[in-house]
Interface confidence: low
């Protein structure tokens, strides 16, 4: 018996061929011997089966001795043995219809679980293998689960259902809702304007929700909410903002925040959360601000950084075009009695300069000491 696999909602064509290459009488029946369709000369006739409005054939092929049964908009319950009677012969075809669906929604938050459920006809024992967009394979029977979805899981999942050594392929588009970056760091000199951007790693027609930026300043004992906002159809509106600092927010996506000036008291770490309508859970992105200040006070030239710096970062003070006078893995360096000229304060990581601040030291004219 020939086995054909079909997909729920698709169209399937079951073939039936006569040895005579001409139009002769044929009938398609189901396993209960109920007629589905057949011919009366050149006319298509239909029987009382449940497939009545979804069954068809190709009259153009009858003259070649081909009498296909076409079933549209397949349902799981269409799984059956179909019998083609032609030339005193009976051809049997077993049709097995499968459906594969994602649990609840195909738009899932990063870290959530994806469950794929296979609908299959009674008596079948299929296995399923799915390949994620990043090339990872998962196998299962009636259900497959993937926990802790990552950004790279966004895209088309290709799932293959195997039954009786036959295969049928499903494609399911999954969108993982996440920010493009889990974390970012901004380096600024004191007084400079700071731009924070929070691009999303997905696009959807309508995006509605609410968000908040909590900030833990390095100098502060506790964190505080800097801004809260609403998102309606990709339009951003600020609900509440602190007086210090007075953040500004862009009205369109990507989410964009401007801090008028970088000050040591603002250096620290923030966590932007975004709660999306009809989704349980929130999207998170961490953002860090490092602020540098170079100052000259009497005979002391000092360079300091505030904020979350890694222990391997190097802070240096050097006179322009000369070797570094002082270089330490610390958050403050200084030079006593600096020479006149343009001094540079550099924050670097393995030789790559992350932040630079220049300060001009003027010559000091000392008066001669009296004898």
């Amino acid at each position: 018996k020939k086995v054909v696999l079909g997909k729920k909602g698709d169209t399937v064509e079951l073939t039936c061929t006569a040895s005579q290459k001409k139009s002769i009488q044929f009938h398609w029946k189901n396993s209960n011997q109920i007629k589905i369709l057949g011919n009366q000369g050149s006319f298509l006739t239909k029987g009382p089966s449940k497939l009545n409005d979804r069954a068809d054939s190709r009259r153009s092929l009858w003259d070649q001795g081909n009498f296909p049964l076409i079933i549209k908009n397949l349902k799981i319950e269409d799984s059956d043995t179909y019998i083609c009677e032609v030339e005193d012969q009976k051809e049997e075809v077993q049709l097995l219809v499968f459906g594969l669906t994602a649990n609840s929604d195909t738009h899932l938050l990063q870290g959530q679980s994806l469950t794929l459920t296979l609908e299959s006809p009674p008596g079948s024992s299929p296995s399923v293998q799915c390949r994620s967009p990043r090339g990872k394979n998962i196998q299962g029977g009636k259900t497959l689960s993937v926990s802790q979805l990552e950004l790279q899981d966004s895209g088309t999942w290709t799932c293959t259902v195997l039954q009786n050594q036959k295969k049928v392929e499903f494609k399911i588009d999954i969108v993982v809702l996440a920010f493009q970056k889990a974390s970012s760091i901004v380096y600024k000199k004191e007084g400079e304007q700071v731009e924070f951007s929070f691009p999303l790693a997905f696009t959807v027609e309508k995006l509605t929700g609410s968000g908040e930026l909590w900030w833990q300043a390095e100098r502060a004992s506790s964190s505080k909410s800097w801004i809260t906002f609403d998102l309606k159809n990709k339009e951003v509106s600020v609900k509440r903002v602190t007086q210090d600092p007075k953040l500004q927010m862009g009205k369109k996506l990507p989410l964009h925040l401007t801090l008028p000036q970088a000050l040591p008291q603002y250096a620290g770490s923030g966590n932007l959360t975004l709660a999306l309508e009809a989704k349980t859970g929130k999207l998170h992105q961490e953002v860090n601000l490092v602020v540098m200040r170079a100052t000259q006070l009497q005979k002391n030239l000092t360079c300091e950084v505030w904020g979350p710096t890694s222990p391997k970062l190097m802070l240096s003070l050097k006179l322009e075009n000369k070797e570094a006078k002082v270089s330490k893995r610390e958050k403050a360096v200084w030079v006593l009695n600096p020479e006149a000229g343009m001094w540079q304060c550099l924050l670097s990581d393995s030789g790559q300069v992350l932040l630079e601040s220049n300060i001009k030291v003027l010559p000091t004219w000392s008066t001669p000491v009296q004898p």
């Epitope: 967009p133 090339g135 966004s154 895209g155 036959k166 392929e169």
Partner: antibody, heavy 118, light 107 residues
Framework: EVQLQQSGPELVKPGDSVKMSCKAS????????MDWVKQSHGKSLEWIGY????????NNNQKFKGKATLTVDKSSSTAYMELHSLTSEDSAVYYC???????????WGQGTLVTVSS | DILLTQSPAILSVSPGERVSFSCRAS??????ILWYQQRTNGSPRLLIK???ESISGIPSRFSGSGSGTDFTLSINSVESEDIADYYC?????????FGGGTKLEMK
């Protein structure tokens, strides 16, 4: 050893059709997709579509809808591609390539050169 | 359709050098990228699948990296037999698409 043997070069007139073949050996023909790829002279590669020999299911690149018809003959483990209403734009090398579920185009035929000229 | 942009168009190297080919996708595609080598008058040959997975029979000097939208194929010590065109291809969604290719030349 997996082998894909393609038919020889074709010189055809504009407006005509051409049917090329790709005979597979060294593996179970019905277990893998057979894809077809176009490469115009000095240009990159373009995916035309695939056929799944097990059930004859096809999926074509929209760009080649109506241009390419993919078929198979399971008894001879051969895949066919017929190109219709040929123009000079269709002059190219056409490759068949075997694709599994967890790999790219791991095996390629040697290519069939089609030249459309009056 | 997903557009794959390869750069540079031509790379000139000396034997023994390390070389890297870049491929950028127009949208996030996870690690669904494959790399092929095509020598003059030859058929393409699969080098790397799913961005970084090696293919049996391919020399270990070929490696791949990247995810999301930016991908790299590297040859850590170029040999004369590596002179060829190199193509990336995405298998994330239909239609499958190829990059425009990078030609590797010897100085």
């Amino acid at each position: 050893e997996v082998q894909l043997q393609q038919s020889g070069p074709e010189l055809v007139k504009p407006g005509d059709s051409v049917k090329m073949s790709c005979k597979a050996s060294g593996y179970t023909f019905t277990d893998y997709f057979m894809d077809w790829v176009k490469q115009s002279h000095g240009k990159s590669l373009e995916w035309i579509g695939y056929i799944y020999p097990n059930n004859g299911g096809t999926n074509n690149n929209q760009k080649f809808k109506g241009k390419a018809t993919l078929t198979v003959d399971k008894s001879s483990s051969t895949a066919y591609m017929e190109l219709h209403s040929l123009t000079s734009e269709d002059s190219a090398v056409y490759y068949c390539a075997r694709r599994g579920y967890d790999e790219g185009f791991a095996y390629w035929g040697q290519g069939t050169l089609v030249t459309v000229s009056s | 359709d997903i557009l794959l942009t390869q750069s540079p168009a031509i790379l000139s190297v000396s034997p023994g050098e390390r070389v890297s080919f870049s491929c950028r996708a127009s949208q996030i595609i996870g690690t669904s990228i494959l790399w092929y080598q095509q020598r003059t008058n030859g058929s393409p040959r699969l080098l790397i699948k799913y961005a970084s997975e090696s293919i049996s029979g391919i020399p270990s000097r070929f490696s791949g990296s990247g995810s999301g939208t930016d991908f790299t194929l590297s040859i850590n010590s170029v040999e004369s037999e590596d002179i060829a065109d190199y193509y990336c291809q995405q298998s994330n969604t239909w239609p499958f698409t190829f990059g425009g290719g990078t030609k590797l030349e010897m100085k």
